[in-house]
């Protein structure tokens, strides 16, 4: 038996998320350790509830003096996690979120992991590698993605409502076939998620099923529903 409800069928189409780690091979050596400060900034969408690993620039361990992770989250004081190689000492300042940790001991691996990613982890993460040749930076603008909950129902005569609830960022809704649609409504929640609602009407009585297609960075979903007969439309002419 199908798990799909009888007339309303949901689907996850194509998931478009990047992998959970953008780490390069740590054995890579930064070319000719120039005195110029190397600054790399990466925008990175990560799905909520997954794990993420953020990496430092690929600097040889023997050239390191200090590794510092700076974490700037909305509405919170800046958190720093640092490791001094000379003393093998780690230090934390203003870091209260236990889900953000070193992958292992910093002398083994300088990567930072978020396990699991929560909506509050939206923010800027920067690794600073201090070496005798200068400081090397890698920054991440982490955008936490939240998959919207999608519903479709017929509200009244040949009028359907499709909702993409609490997504981040806002989802986009389209219809097959095109209907007579009211302007899309958006409701913003305090946690940064958005509910998108689209209401459409189909006058043509030859329209049998309508499909709501929801596009989102976490993947696309489509649902369809067979429209009910208009009350009073008893039988078609024979």
């Amino acid at each position: 038996q199908s798990n799909n409800s009888l007339m309303l069928q949901t689907s996850k189409e194509n998931h478009t998320l990047a992998s959970n780690s953008l780490c390069m091979d740590e054995k890579q050596i930064t070319q000719n350790h120039s005195k110029v400060l190397a600054e790399v900034n990466i925008s990175w969408p990560v799905q909520m509830a997954r794990n993420a690993v953020l990496c430092c620039p690929p600097i040889e361990f023997r050239n390191l003096i200090v590794i510092t992770w700076e974490i700037i989250l909305r509405g919170q004081p800046s958190c720093t996690k640092s490791y001094r190689k000379e003393t093998n000492e780690t230090k934390e300042t203003n870091c209260t979120d236990e889900r953000i940790t070193w992958v292992s001991t910093p002398d083994q691996n300088s990567d930072l992991q978020i396990h699991p990613v929560a909506i509050t982890h939206d923010g800027y993460y920067r690794c600073i590698m201090a070496t005798p040749d200068g400081n090397f930076h890698r920054g991440y603008h982490l955008q936490v993605l939240v998959t919207p909950e999608v519903t479709l129902f017929e509200s009244r005569n040949r009028t359907a409502v499709c909702k993409a609830v609490a997504g981040k960022p806002a989802a986009q809704i389209s219809w097959i076939p095109a209907g007579d649609c009211a302007p899309t409504e958006q409701e913003y929640w305090g946690n940064g998620t958005v509910t998108v609602k689209s209401t459409c009407h189909w006058e043509g009585h030859n329209v049998s099923t309508v499909t709501c297609h929801v596009s989102h960075l976490t993947g696309n979903k489509s649902l369809y529903i067979e429209l009910l007969p208009v009350p009073g439309a008893k039988k078609s002419a024979k």
Epitope: L6, S222, K235
Partner: antibody, heavy 114, light 107 residues
Framework: QVQLQQPGSELVRPGASVKLSCKAS????????MHWVKQRPGQGLEWIGN????????NYDEKFKSKATLTVDTSSSTAYMQISSLTSEDSAVYYC???????WGQGTLVTVSA | DVQMIQSPSSLSASLGDIVTMTCQAS??????LNWFQQKPGKAPKLLIY???NLEDGVPSRFSGSRYGTDFTLTVSSLEDEDMATYFC?????????FGGGTKLEIK
């Protein structure tokens, strides 16, 4: 578990009528459209029409408007299709289907023969 | 009525092959579509609903895709049990219309 039960076969005379049944179970019969589909031996599938059991509303393909009549008995959760003025062209397997074509009956083979 | 043009009408392939068949909606109509497998003497079995979604219990070697009003069913690694006739169905407009079918034979 959604099930649509149809009798296996019907043998009928040319010019007569036949009433095919489709007994539904495992879901709310009155809330979902029931569709009927024809398949001639070795041929493709043709949509005949549909009925909404909650109101009795029907739609027919133009080709079948004077040939088929769809009805329901909500007390027994059964959909019916009556085919009239039978000819050899009506010899086919007839299926009922619901759930936007997710669920199908096993089909009834109608043979029109003198 | 929306016509569904299905091609090819038949194809022969070897075990392990990748096979594709297509359905095209007439007049560039925007529709939604399901794919079915039918074996002799049996009712059609839903494989793909909403053009791209695998029905529960259907092997993952079956997949559907859409490009505008062109729809494709792909079987990624043909098996003996896939020998059957495949149909598409557009269910957006009444009357519902089926493709003419693709008969898949194993070489």
């Amino acid at each position: 578990q959604v099930q649509l039960q149809q009798p296996g076969s019907e043998l009928v005379r040319p010019g007569a009528s036949v009433k095919l049944s489709c007994k539904a179970s495992g879901y709310t019969f009155t809330s979902y459209w029931m569709h009927w589909v024809k398949q001639r031996p070795g041929q493709g599938l043709e949509w005949i029409g549909n009925i909404y059991p909650g109101s009795g509303t029907t739609n027919y393909d133009e080709k079948f408007k004077s040939k088929a009549t769809l009805t329901v008995d909500t007390s027994s959760s059964t959909a019916y299709m009556q085919i009239s003025s039978l000819t050899s062209e009506d010899s086919a397997v007839y299926y009922c289907t619901t759930g936007t074509s997710t669920y199908w009956g096993q089909g009834t083979l109608v043979t029109v023969s003198a | 009525d929306v016509q569904m043009i299905q091609s090819p009408s038949s194809l022969s392939a070897s075990l392990g092959d990748i096979v594709t068949m297509t359905c095209q909606a007439s007049q560039g109509t925007s529709i939604n579509l399901n794919w079915f497998q039918q074996k002799p003497g049996k009712a059609p079995k839903l494989l793909i609903y909403g053009a791209v979604n695998l029905e529960d219990g259907v092997p993952s070697r079956f997949s559907g895709s859409r490009y505008g009003t062109d729809f494709t069913l792909t079987v990624s690694s043909l098996e003996d049990e896939d020998m059957a006739t495949y149909f598409c169905l557009q269910h957006t407009y009444l009357p519902w219309t089926f493709g003419g079918g693709t008969k898949l034979e194993i070489k």
